[in-house]
Interface confidence: low
């Protein structure tokens, strides 16, 4: 159980990406921008990338930056699971993995991250602008969801290397220690953007939400920003979402887990489990859906399959105690 604010060292770029000099210049501003937008705030990161080998094949990687034990992960597309999204996969640490077409392979990468490969062919294949969401439920952190999509201008296989961000901690001192670096990074980012403003650059995806709910809602909500946390997702292009998937969902509870082989249930264990906690760097936006209850005039939360979330029995704080130590 980690008890202090930590800023993991930046990982080296993924193999095959470090060779392009010009690409590094392109990636750096987005790494910085991601840090500026998400530093110290989101609990979940999402990375969406299109495979260079199969242009219509997607890989979604998601991770949880909490310290508790993950009870369940739900991956959906077309928006958050409870807001019109369709479940692609459900991963349970002990009971195994269940996935629905076009999901081809869902797996645990570490104790706190998963990956999902989507099949590219057929009517149910995703579009480049499809939103993918990952919802992690753990004790004691609660439920956290983040969404991401491929930027319109992204080149296949060229998504930036996942970059660890500062972890949201109960102790603010560590985060404040990082803030100076981030401030410098943000200033440097603005400088870079001004220098390279003649270049077309990929954009973060503000269009996925309604105008009054900017991406900045990934920040830990203050009283003033709570309203933004509850703004429903705007409707996105649904032509990429299969109409038949909904019928495949199990309902009425987790009875379907019983049929899963137990050998499929194990996640990687050991000291490396927390070593790799990347966040999306290029184009994949991060959002956190924390206000999970219906307010006046809002829909009550609903998450699709009967067993989809294990939110926080404690309530608000994500990082306080040694409750869910693996």
């Amino acid at each position: 159980m980690r008890t202090e604010a930590q800023v993991p060292a930046l990982q080296p770029p993924e193999p095959g990406l470090e060779g392009a000099m010009g690409h590094r210049t392109l990636v750096l501003p987005w790494v910085l921008l991601t840090l500026c937008v998400t530093a110290g705030t989101p609990e979940v990161w999402v990375q969406v990338r299109m495979e260079a080998t199969e242009l219509s094949s997607f890989t979604i990687r998601c991770g949880f930056l909490g310290s508790g034990s993950i009870s369940l992960v739900t991956v959906s597309w077309g928006g958050p699971n409870g807001a019109g999204g369709t479940t692609l996969a459900v991963l349970h640490p002990e009971r195994g993995i269940r996935q629905w077409a076009p999901a081809r392979q869902a797996r645990w990468e570490t104790q706190s991250s998963i990956s999902l490969i989507l099949e590219g062919s057929g009517a149910s294949s995703p579009c480049a602008n499809t939103t993918f969401c990952c919802k992690f439920a753990s004790f004691p952190e609660g439920s956290w969801e983040a969404c991401g999509s491929l930027p319109p201008s992204s080149d296949p296989g060229l998504s930036a290397p996942p970059t660890p961000a500062p972890i949201l901690r109960a102790d603010l001192a560590g985060i404040l220690g990082v803030s100076g670096v981030l401030l410098f990074g943000c200033v440097y980012l603005l400088h870079l953007l001004r220098r390279h403003k003649h270049r077309p650059a990929p954009r973060l995806q503000p269009s996925r939400t309604s105008p009054q709910a900017p991406r900045a809602r990934a920040w830990a909500p203050s009283q003033a920003s709570q309203a933004a946390l509850h703004v429903p997702y705007a409707t996105i292009n649904t032509s990429c979402r299969p109409a038949t998937l909904d019928t495949a969902h199990p309902h009425g509870g987790p009875s379907w887990w019983a049929s899963l082989p137990t050998h499929a249930a194990h996640r990687p264990q050991g000291p490396a489990a927390w070593a790799s906690t990347p966040i999306p760097a290029r184009g994949s936006f991060v959002s956190v859906e924390n206000g999970l209850y219906a307010q006046a005039g809002e829909r009550p939360p609903h998450t699709g399959p009967g067993l989809t979330l294990f939110p926080d029995p404690r309530g608000p704080r994500a990082m306080e105690g040694p409750l869910g130590v693996r």
């Epitope: 369940l72 109960a170 704080r317």
Partner: antibody, heavy 116, light 106 residues
């Protein structure tokens, strides 16, 4: 609208057991932990434990371990707490509560009176 | 077990008055949460993460503190604020509440 409707007042003898219920509506019952909190007359609040109805996973405190049993019925969206080996110290109002992040919902409470 | 001690146990304030109540923890906690409970009613979470107001809580309420010392402040007391306020920590099991501060209106 989220609602937690708790069962009515209970009167029990020392040494007996009692089972109180909390029926949830207005949200997906299986997706949220249900807490149980005790409040003795004129006193403060005491956290008993929590259950996740989706799989029956529970968290409890050492004080109530073995004596408080938390269960949930998904079909009726109802959570239960069973207290055994009752003593006068168990006379209290018992609240169920489901909360996550920025909002919380509580039942109206069930008053348990243990008397001979 | 972390013991939370609230003071004063009972206090009264006039409308418009500034009110501050404290919660002292027996060992350091990262965040404190506050609940409001009116007579005969269920508790409501009022402030979470030390200083964030739950939706619907008036802006005259504020929370602050760190380590072992936390406080809840009402900048301008109003009649509807009369209630008992409990602090709570979620850092270690058992997740203890303070004994409460009963705030009355003069």
């Amino acid at each position: 609208q989220v609602q937690l409707q708790q069962s009515g007042a209970e009167l029990a003898r020392p040494g007996a057991s009692v089972k109180m219920s909390c029926k949830a509506s207005g949200y997906t019952f299986t997706d949220y932990w249900m807490q149980w909190v005790k409040q003795r007359p004129g006193q403060g609040l005491e956290w008993i434990g929590a259950i996740f109805p989706g799989n029956g996973e529970t968290r409890d405190t050492q004080k109530f371990k073995g004596r408080a049993t938390l269960t949930a019925d998904r079909s009726s969206s109802t959570a239960y707490i069973q207290l055994s080996s009752l003593t006068s110290e168990d006379s209290a109002v018992y609240y169920c509560a489901t909360f996550n992040n920025y909002l919380d919902y509580w039942g109206q409470g069930t008053t348990l009176t243990v008397a001979s | 077990q972390i013991v939370l001690t609230q003071s004063p146990a009972i206090m009264s304030a006039s409308p418009g008055e500034k009110v501050t109540m404290t919660c002292s923890a027996s060992s350091s906690v990262s965040y404190m949460h506050w609940y409001q409970q009116k007579s005969g009613a269920s508790p409501k979470r009022w402030i979470y993460d030390t200083s964030k107001l739950t939706s619907g809580v008036p802006a005259r309420f504020s929370g602050s503190g760190s380590g072992t010392s936390y406080s809840l402040t009402i900048s301008n007391m109003e009649a509807e604020d009369a209630a008992t306020y409990y602090c709570q920590q979620w850092i270690s099991n058992p997740y203890t509440f303070g004994g409460g501060t009963k705030l009355e209106i003069k």
